[in-house]
């Protein structure tokens, strides 16, 4: 049973590697050559299509057996060597072989441009096993070609070590034009040259281009792909394509927008988005860029107040975030504000000015003019100072706190007063004799605490001394004051 | 009909060489490949390589390489197995099997096997 | 090397069951796998080729599937001359391997 010839026919997705092959019914051998001994290479034809043998790519093997037989010389048939179709056909194709059994080994592989062709799920591969010859025929087939088909396909056999290779079959998909390069979209300068360009490829070739402004034909003779149009300026947005023409027709770009640069719109939505007392925090909308990327931004700050001088303070800032803190500005003070930004073209106008204001601040100086006495009759600390200039104040006083410490014998206490706005002087109990008393005086108004005056010292005696003197607020560089009674 | 014929059983000691024959009978021997397969008592199946019948080129699996020699006699439609310096390991049934076809490596026809006892 | 793994040492069947066999492959062996029954004492005796093609003369209640790494070797209406040893191999690429086997026996 097994020495009958048989035809083995069966689909193998995976290359290289062993054939697929099933024994199946009885057929007379489609080949036929003489028996291995004595064995004289013989005449091979496809057994699809008969046709005459190639010698191109014949392989004689080098392996000798012990007993020196040579094994005879292998070589693919002749096939189609150059299929044209169209885009989304099917193709099929094949290399067939007739390989002596005395091979024993062989595995056949699908390459395309170099590439090995794992995987190929369309190959199938059949064969035809008689007692003396195996018949091989591997079919590629796509059911669907695209572009990226198109090559250079050949079958390897690889036998004994030896690499047997067909024919060379060249695929080669036609169809419209196929853009490698379409025209892109351009912000432009007004007046100003620019280029645009058009690359198309079929097969088949030649490709022509033919450009089209706004509708309307820009070339009266086409040009051969690649096409490189030069506009010498526009004054006015237009849109441009290209249309790629071969013998199977026309293939349309894409149309791109042409803009002209222009100076931006303003900004819109100018908002507040915290206040303190000697900043604000802004953020804005961007108004359209005018083709042109923003550049950098510039924020105008004038004080509202109808008696100042108008005088406007710039601060400039990168485009981005669209975010700026405006600092070094007075504390309860009102500001109008608008923000303008730029791109390569110019300046926008200015945003729609706002109002925004300044909180209350702590007071940025201390009372001055600190004068301590000792009310020895009394039993009493008077304190004597003047209030910190108005725009130091940094909003409307509430009081004062005071701040005396007691130090004797290593003892030392800390004491806070509250003093309402209006005074400006205070009277403290004394809390230790034989003492040294520090005073030091804030202004407060409803932001907060504002820095205490230097130290001002005055020794409180034991009962019974008699002459007391003031003591103040030391000129600047001068050492604590100390009152000795 | 096609039919692989071995050698019989063989007791060897442990340093010994045994040499195994195939004999073919049914076919054109020098039209397919020989090989042999390994399979140790209780054990599965081992490809040890096979043989060029017409150009007597041997293959042989790595852990095969060394002490194994795969041979023929052509005109006796003969192969064999040659087992040099024999270890406990090498105590088996050793199969010759016939490559299918030039395109297929599966095995159509076993022979009924030798079983080699390496004993001290 | 390419790795096959036969997970079913032992398999227990009744007479007239069905049957399934499986064999994973470590990668892509395409459908280049056979199966083959062994019986104590006797060769290996193909039964499938090209992972579904019956070899000649076996009967139609064996069945082969599967391609790439999963393969199946399926028998109907077990009948009591089926228990033996069943190996799968593989032979894409060299060296050709084995299946360790998976033993049929009786519940």
């Known amino acids: 049973a097994i020495t009958e010839a048989r035809e083995e026919a069966k689909p193998y997705p995976l290359f290289p590697g062993p054939f697929p092959g099933s024994l199946q019914t009885d057929h007379t051998p489609l080949l036929s050559l003489p028996h291995a001994s004595g064995y004289q290479p013989a005449l091979m034809f496809s057994p699809t299509q008969p046709g005459r043998p190639h010698t191109g790519n014949v392989a004689i093997p080098q392996v000798t057996s012990v007993e020196s037989k040579p094994l005879p010389p292998l070589a693919f048939k002749h096939t189609v060597g150059h299929i044209i179709l169209s885009e989304h056909k099917g193709v099929k194709f094949n290399c067939s072989i007739s390989v002596p059994n005395i091979y024993q080994d062989t595995t056949i592989s699908w390459w395309k441009d170099g590439k090995e062709l794992l995987g190929a799920h369309h190959a199938i591969t059949q064969f035809y096993p008689d007692d003396e010859v195996t018949a091989i025929i591997a079919s590629f087939s796509i059911t669907s070609v695209q572009r990226s088909d198109n090559g250079s396909y050949i079958c390897k056999m690889k036998i004994n070590n030896e690499e047997i290779v067909s024919d060379p079959i060249y695929i080669e998909v036609q169809g419209l034009p196929h853009f490698t390069k379409q025209p892109e979209s351009m912000n432009v300068t007004r007046n100003t040259a620019f280029n645009l360009t058009c690359q198309a490829v079929g097969p088949p070739e030649p490709v022509n281009i033919f450009w089209v402004q706004n509708s309307s034909r820009v070339n009266e003779q086409p040009e051969k792909s690649p096409s490189v149009l030069t506009v010498p300026g526009l004054t006015e947005m237009a849109v441009f394509s290209c249309e790629a023409h071969n013998d199977k027709g026309l293939t349309v770009s894409k149309g791109v927008q042409i803009n002209i640069k222009a100076i931006p719109s303003p900004p819109t939505e100018v908002s507040i988005r915290n206040s303190t007392a000697h900043s604000i925090l802004i953020s804005w909308v961007p108004g359209f860029d005018g083709y042109s990327p923003f550049r950098n931004c510039s924020i105008q700050v004038k004080e509202a107040d109808p008696l100042s001088n108008g005088s406007v303070m710039i601060f400039n800032t990168s485009a981005l975030p669209h975010l700026y803190q405006i600092k070094q500005l007075q504390a309860l003070a009102n500001y109008s504000i608008g923000v303008s930004c730029m791109n390569e073209i110019g300046w926008s106008a200015v945003s729609p000015w706002i109002l925004a204001s300044t909180t209350e601040g702590a007071p940025s100086v201390a009372p001055l003019n600190v004068t301590v006495f000792l009310n020895e009759s009394s039993d009493n600390v008077d304190i004597r100072w003047m209030k910190p200039p108005t725009k130091q104040q940094d909003g409307e006083l509430v009081g004062y706190r005071i701040s005396h410490v007691w130090q004797s014998a290593g003892i030392s206490k800390e004491l806070l007063e509250e003093v309402g706005q209006n005074g400006s002087r205070a009277r403290i109990s004394v809390q230790v004799h034989n003492a040294t008393c520090t005073v030091r005086i804030a202004a407060v108004t409803r932001g907060g605490v504002g820095p205490f005056s230097d130290p001002v010292k005055i020794f409180i005696p034991a009962h019974g001394w008699v002459d007391y003197a003031p003591s103040s607020t030391p000129a600047p560089g001068n050492a604590d004051p100390v009152l000795i009674i | 009909q096609v039919k692989l014929e071995e050698s019989g059983p063989e007791l060897k000691k442990p340093g010994e060489t045994v040499k195994i024959s195939c004999k073919a009978s049914g076919y054109t021997f020098t039209n397919y490949g020989m090989n042999w397969v390994k399979q140790a008592p209780g054990k599965g199946l081992k490809w040890m390589g096979w043989i060029n019948t017409y150009t007597g080129e041997p293959t042989y699996a790595d852990d095969f390489k060394g002490r194994f020699v795969f041979s023929l006699e052509t005109s006796a439609s003969t192969a064999y197995l040659q087992i040099n310096n024999l270890k406990n390991e090498d105590m088996a049934t050793y199969f010759c099997?016939?490559?299918?076809?030039?395109?297929?490596?599966?095995?159509?026809?076993w022979g009924a096997g030798t079983t080699v006892t390496v004993s001290s | 090397d390419i790795v096959l793994t036969q997970t079913h040492k032992f398999m227990s069947t009744s007479v007239g069951d069905r049957v399934s066999i499986t064999c994973k492959a470590s990668?892509?062996?395409?459908?280049?796998v056979t199966w083959c029954q062994q019986k104590p004492g006797q060769p290996p005796k193909l039964l499938i080729y090209?992972?579904?093609t019956r070899h000649t003369g076996v009967p139609d209640r064996f069945t082969g599937s599967g391609s790439g790494t999963d393969f199946t070797l399926t028998i109907n209406n077990v009948q009591s001359e089926d228990l033996a040893d069943y190996f799968c191999?593989?032979?894409?690429?060299?060296?050709?391997?084995f299946g360790a086997g998976t033993k049929l026996e009786l519940k």
């Open positions: 191999q593989q032979y894409r690429s060299y060296p050709l391997t």
């Open positions: 099997a016939r490559k299918s076809t030039v395109v297929s490596r599966y095995f159509d026809v």
């Open positions: 990668q892509d062996v395409g459908d280049a």
């Open positions: 090209w992972a579904s």
